[in-house]
């Protein structure tokens, strides 16, 4: 399976949901509603 | 006016899918997360997943795991949220949100 | 899933005065990171959704700050300091410590 990142930085292997320490992916909106950045 | 502009209304019988778009309006959708959520007439939300539109990879709650397949089209600034097999209990108003915007909501009505 | 309980379902209130609203989660939101992955929405009538707080207790852009949030690791508070008309509508808390669960919603409405 494809690994990548959750929202709040958990890391997913084979669906298993492992916390990852940082908040990965906070700068791509990964808290719905947050507004990133500018409007680009 | 920055804002994330969503498809129509939808009625459809039970079994069938439809597809809800999501068009960015001076905002660019592939540049961040797209989440979807639902929610139930009179109920609380529920997220149903999120896409990173950079690649492709998505996260679904697992209850919407064979039940909703997120896409986006980076040409066109839209993401598509696809249901299939629908039931009453899909009924509900879905919503896509990406950054500090909203879609308006699409009600999708499933009935026979 | 993580639960999210949330108490009251409704909460009449009076304008110029405080209120409150609690949420509760079913395992603890604290990360050893030292965040809290607990969120507050309000839902304004025949609106979209939109972010108060995130992380327990930061405001989102643009929101008045008679709004605060603070809690432990399982138990939340969302206050306002003084209620305006304009705060009625539906308040959710949600957490994304475990992918994205939401509570059943707090009607705020004026008495």
């Known amino acids: 399976d494809a690994e990548f990142r959750h929202d709040s930085g958990y890391e997913v292997h084979h669906q298993k949901l492992v916390f990852f320490a940082e908040d990965v992916g906070s700068n791509k909106g990964a808290i719905i509603g947050l507004m990133v950045g500018g409007v680009v | 006016q920055v804002q994330l502009v969503q498809s129509g209304a939808e009625v459809k019988e039970p079994g069938a899918s439809v597809k809800v778009s999501c068009t960015g309006s001076g905002f660019n959708i592939h540049v961040y997360y797209v989440h979807w959520l639902r929610q139930l007439p009179e109920k609380g939300l529920e997220w149903i997943g999120r896409?990173?539109?950079?690649?492709?990879?998505?996260i679904y709650t697992p209850k919407f795991q064979d039940k909703a397949t997120l896409t986006v089209d980076t040409s066109t600034d839209t993401a598509y949220m696809e249901l299939s097999s629908l039931r009453s209990e899909d009924t509900a108003v879905y919503y896509c949100?990406?950054?500090?915007?909203w879609g308006q909501g699409t009600l999708v009505t499933v009935s026979s | 899933d993580i639960v999210m309980t949330q108490s009251p379902l409704s909460n009449p209130v009076t304008p110029g005065e405080p209120a409150s609203i609690s949420c509760r989660s079913s395992?603890?939101?604290?990360?050893?990171?030292?965040?809290?992955?607990l969120y507050w929405y309000l839902q304004k009538p025949g609106q979209s959704p939109q972010l108060l707080i995130y992380?327990?207790?930061n405001l989102a852009s643009g929101v008045p700050d008679r709004f605060s949030s603070s809690g432990s690791g399982t138990d939340f508070t969302l206050k306002i300091s003084r209620v305006e008309a304009e705060d009625v509508g539906v308040y959710y808390c949600?957490?994304?410590?475990?992918?994205?669960?939401f509570g059943q919603g707090t009607k705020v409405e004026i008495k």
């Open positions: 949100v990406s950054s500090g915007y």
């Open positions: 395992k603890s939101l604290l990360h050893r990171n030292g965040k809290t992955y």
């Open positions: 949600a957490q994304n410590l475990e992918l994205w669960t």
């Open positions: 992380q327990m207790d």
């Open positions: 896409i990173d539109p950079e690649n492709g990879e998505t």
